[in-house]
């Protein structure tokens, strides 16, 4: 029972994680304009992996895609690649894990096959989570480097008379979504690997020996016992584990009712 619960929970956690990785990859707010010195701004810039956006205080938002491939920074390309690899591995892992779930019966699939599939999907989830975490971390590192570089020459101009304020960027919501999602996928993968150990039938390296009792001929084969899980032919005990994933509407919070600028 515990093995099935671990496998089911691992699947649900990984599913939520991969959904989060996909969401993070698609989000526009990987980097957002730093508002530390100016919490109320008339023009707000933010950037994603695929496009950059500008939101005016009038409410008008304009997004422009990065239509060049060769002109983009190598780091951005690397982050894109890591996220896509993470999504692909995660998606394949989900597909494999569906068939590996103990609560789903497909023909006469052996438990050993399900164990192998569970392990495979678990490893895929772990790699997927690591890819997402790596991608987000690389981007975050790039932001930190650029932030301090722009801080160093915050104001440039002609003899200090005219100020050209450089736009500084800080961590966007997508980074946090990516980190959490990557972590969840990783945890889900570990849970699947743990579940695999419980699913695999214990094998011994000595042959079966027949014991002959008087009047009866019974063959005992060591290693042929399986732990009762409550699943299998007895379908009355089936439990569905709900991951409880829910999406909350994004709530925009304002620093105060009235802003003075």
């Amino acid at each position: 029972m515990a093995v099935t619960a671990c496998q089911g929970l691992g699947f649900v956690v990984s599913l939520i994680g991969i959904a989060g990785i996909i969401a993070a990859t698609c989000m526009d707010q990987w980097s957002t304009q730093d508002l530390y010195n100016n919490p109320v701004t008339a023009v707000f810039n933010y950037q994603g992996l695929w496009r950059s956006c500008v939101r005016e205080s009038s409410g008008f938002t304009e997004c422009r895609g990065y239509f060049t491939l060769l002109g983009l920074p190598a780091m951005l390309q690397a982050v894109r690649a890591l996220m896509i690899v993470g999504i692909v591995l995660g998606a394949i892992g989900l597909l494999v894990s569906i068939f590996a779930l103990k609560c789903i019966r497909i023909g006469s699939m052996e438990d050993s096959a399900k164990a192998n599939m569970t392990l495979t999907s678990g490893i895929m989830f772990i790699v997927s989570g690591l890819c997402a975490i790596a991608g987000v971390s690389v981007f975050a590192n790039m932001l930190v480097t650029n932030f301090w570089m722009s801080t160093a020459n915050m104001y440039t101009g002609m003899g200090g008379m005219v100020q050209t304020v450089q736009t500084r960027y800080t961590f966007g919501a997508a980074l946090f979504v990516g980190w959490v999602a990557g972590g969840l996928t990783l945890i889900g993968g570990v849970m699947m690997c743990i579940a695999c150990r419980g699913l695999a039938p214990e094998e011994t390296n000595y042959k079966a020996v027949s014991y002959h009792a008087s009047g009866h001929s019974v063959a005992y084969k060591p290693g042929g016992f399986k732990a009762s899980t409550g699943f299998g032919s007895n379908t009355k005990n089936k439990k569905i584990y709900d991951g409880g994933a829910r999406t909350e509407d994004e709530v925009q919070s304002y620093p105060s009712k009235h802003d003075y600028v």
């Epitope: 008339a42 810039n45 500008v54 422009r64 100020q163 050209t164 736009t167």
Partner: antibody, heavy 118, light 113 residues
Framework: QVQLVQSGAEVKKPGASVKVSCKAS????????MNWVRQAPGQGLEWIGQ????????TYNGKFKGRVTMTADKSTSTVYMELSSLRSEDTAVYFC???????????WGQGTLVTVSS | DIVMTQSPDSLAVSLGERATISCKSS????????????LTWYQQKPGQPPKMLIY???TRESGVPDRFSGSGSGIDFTLTISSVQAEDVAVYYC?????????FGQGTKLEIK
């Protein structure tokens, strides 16, 4: 068509308060910020602040801190600008103006003359 | 606050001639995110509210005659009336639309010679 109709002229004594209204029509009232701009006689334009009727969020010019209050009534598509502790230098024509892309003001009210005199 | 300075304060031009009004800001109005300059030009005729002519420094508002054009980037901007008409007599204002509080230039009065 878009129309912004403001309330009539007001004469106030120093220290008093004035509340100017601006009734909007011809567009989705709750979806656009409304700005307030004033113009002293023979002078240039000065931005006072803005309000988003959709949720009542406001942004004010620091110069008017604590003296200005902007409100909106969605049921009547009207925005209000109240200025307290009036001084003689507050004598001006007060305009409401719709805020659009480019952070520009495309439609303006006809203006409300507020005279502060003892 | 960003200070907007217009020049000249007043301008007298013959009908059909070109009129050029300059506007200088104390800080760049160019937004790096979309490479747009957040400067707006308004026309105010006597006894009337201002009318928006140009936004994003060079984008003409619909319904505005094409003799009006805006140019410039960063801190230096220009409003050009290619062929001045009698109805163009007004005061012209530039406005910083990039940073709060929004600020206006002192205005340039256009007259007919």
């Amino acid at each position: 068509q878009v129309q912004l109709v403001q309330s009539g002229a007001e004469v106030k004594k120093p220290g008093a308060s004035v509340k100017v209204s601006c009734k909007a029509s011809g567009y989705a009232f709750s979806s656009y910020w409304m700005n307030w701009v004033r113009q002293a006689p023979g002078q240039g334009l000065e931005w006072i602040g803005q309000i988003y009727p959709g949720n009542g969020d406001t942004t004010y010019n620091g110069k008017f801190k604590g003296r200005v209050t902007m409100t909106a009534d969605k049921s009547t598509s009207t925005v209000y600008m109240e200025l307290s502790s009036l001084r003689s230098e507050d004598t001006a024509v007060y305009f409401c103006a719709r805020f659009v892309k480019g952070n520009a003001m495309d439609y303006w009210g006809q203006g409300t003359l507020v005279t502060v005199s003892s | 606050d960003i200070v907007m300075t217009q020049s000249p304060d007043s301008l007298a031009v013959s009908l059909g001639e070109r009129a050029t009004i300059s506007c200088k800001s104390s800080q760049s109005l160019l937004n790096s995110g979309n490479q747009k300059n957040y400067l707006t030009w308004y026309q105010q005729k006597p006894g009337q509210p201002p009318k928006m002519l140009i936004y994003w420094a060079s984008t003409r508002e619909s319904g505005v005659p094409d003799r009006f054009s805006g140019s410039g980037s960063g801190i230096d901007f220009t409003l050009t009336i290619s062929s001045v008409q009698a109805e163009d007599v007004a005061v012209y204002y530039c406005q910083n639309a990039y940073s709060y509080p929004f600020t206006f230039g002192q205005g340039t009065k256009l007259e007919i010679k």
